[in-house]
């Protein structure tokens, strides 16, 4: 948790005091924000945002869609966050299927994970079709898979996010990449 000099406003404290938390689907999420100047909790995942004016955020039966970033803010505008993964073997990905890239720029395939401890988090072509040999990516369980330096040849590429679960590949819904030329 953050520490500052006496007299200076300090960011709120969150319990549990860790940056990431993994809970199982159906279990309780209980997050406490300790700050005399508490203002609100904010929850964010993909394009969804929710607010809560209670200093204790309680979700009695967690679902995969409760996966995301929980931020507590105080009256000084200072904040602290915890990221919660709700592990659901039946829903490994949260998905926003819009996928646009500009040639030579990176673009994000938005398929954050509900379980950060899965393996082989990667991209697969649709219907077993090969991906471009030069395609490279950066995986981030909280955001998705960033395709590096999108090529014009990737336009209309159909792909899935993929992970391995108990020895089998599990695929997300499909994405179609639209590429804008650089000029």
């Amino acid at each position: 948790q953050p520490s500052v000099s006496p007299g200076e406003p300090s960011p709120p404290s969150i319990h549990p005091g860790k940056s990431d938390l993994i809970v199982r689907v159906g279990d309780e999420i209980r997050l406490l924000c300790t700050d005399p100047g508490f203002v609100k909790w904010t929850f964010e995942i993909l394009d969804e945002t929710n607010e809560n004016k209670q200093n204790e955020w309680i979700t009695e039966k967690a679902e995969a869609t409760n996966t995301g970033k929980y931020t507590c803010t105080n009256k000084h505008g200072l904040s602290n966050s915890i990221y919660v993964f709700v592990r659901d073997p039946a829903k490994l990905f949260l998905v926003d299927r819009s996928l646009y890239g500009k040639e030579d720029n990176d673009t994000l395939v938005r398929c954050p994970l509900t379980d950060p401890e899965v393996t082989n988090y990667s991209l697969k072509g649709c219907q077993g079709k090969p991906l471009p040999k030069d395609l490279r990516f950066i995986p981030d369980p909280k955001a998705g898979i960033m395709i590096k330096s999108v090529k014009r040849a990737y336009h209309r590429l159909c792909l899935h996010c993929s992970v391995d679960q108990e020895g089998k590949s599990v695929l997300s819904e499909k994405f179609i990449l639209k590429v804008r030329p650089a000029f």
Partner: nanobody, 126 residues
Framework: EVQLVESGGGLVQAGGSLRLSCAAS????????MGWFRQAPGKEREFVAA????????YYADSVKGRFTISRDNAKNTVYLQMNSLKPEDTAVYYC???????????????????WGQGTQVTVSS
């Protein structure tokens, strides 16, 4: 330019364990990926495991899943391969590989990695 130095190989009995280390000197970025490959005499170099530097996401060959664990220490620029329940067929020279351009879509293809170590011998006796 990136230099990779492997260590930790040796002779072990079937069922035993070894931990390999690969120390990288040079710049590691968020795009970095480091992996382990192995090559047995007369065979092609094969993928074992890889890890993305930024998020620590892990990738494994089916043949080692559940037995081998790849991990990283960012502060030391080092990647580890913990090998448990070793089998005679795990005998090979183990090579550390790295690339600064991101995880290849075909991360098991050794031709897609730019930097290689000299290798460390692992021998599993029955």
């Amino acid at each position: 330019e990136v230099q990779l130095v492997e260590s930790g190989g040796g002779l072990v009995q079937a069922g035993g364990s070894l931990r390999l280390s690969c120390a990288a000197s040079g710049r590691t970025s968020g795009s970095y990926v480091m992996g382990w490959f192995r090559q047995a005499p007369g065979k092609e170099r094969e993928f074992v495991a890889a890890i993305s530097w930024s998020a620590g996401m892990t990738y494994y060959a089916d043949s080692v899943k559940g037995r081998f664990t790849i991990s990283r220490d960012n502060a030391k620029n080092t990647v580890y391969l913990q090998m448990n329940s070793l089998k005679p067929e795990d005998t090979a020279v183990y090579y550390c590989a790295a690339d600064q351009r991101g995880v290849p879509a075909y991360y098991s293809d050794y031709a897609l990695y730019d930097y290689w170590g000299q290798g460390t011998q692992v021998t599993v006796s029955s």
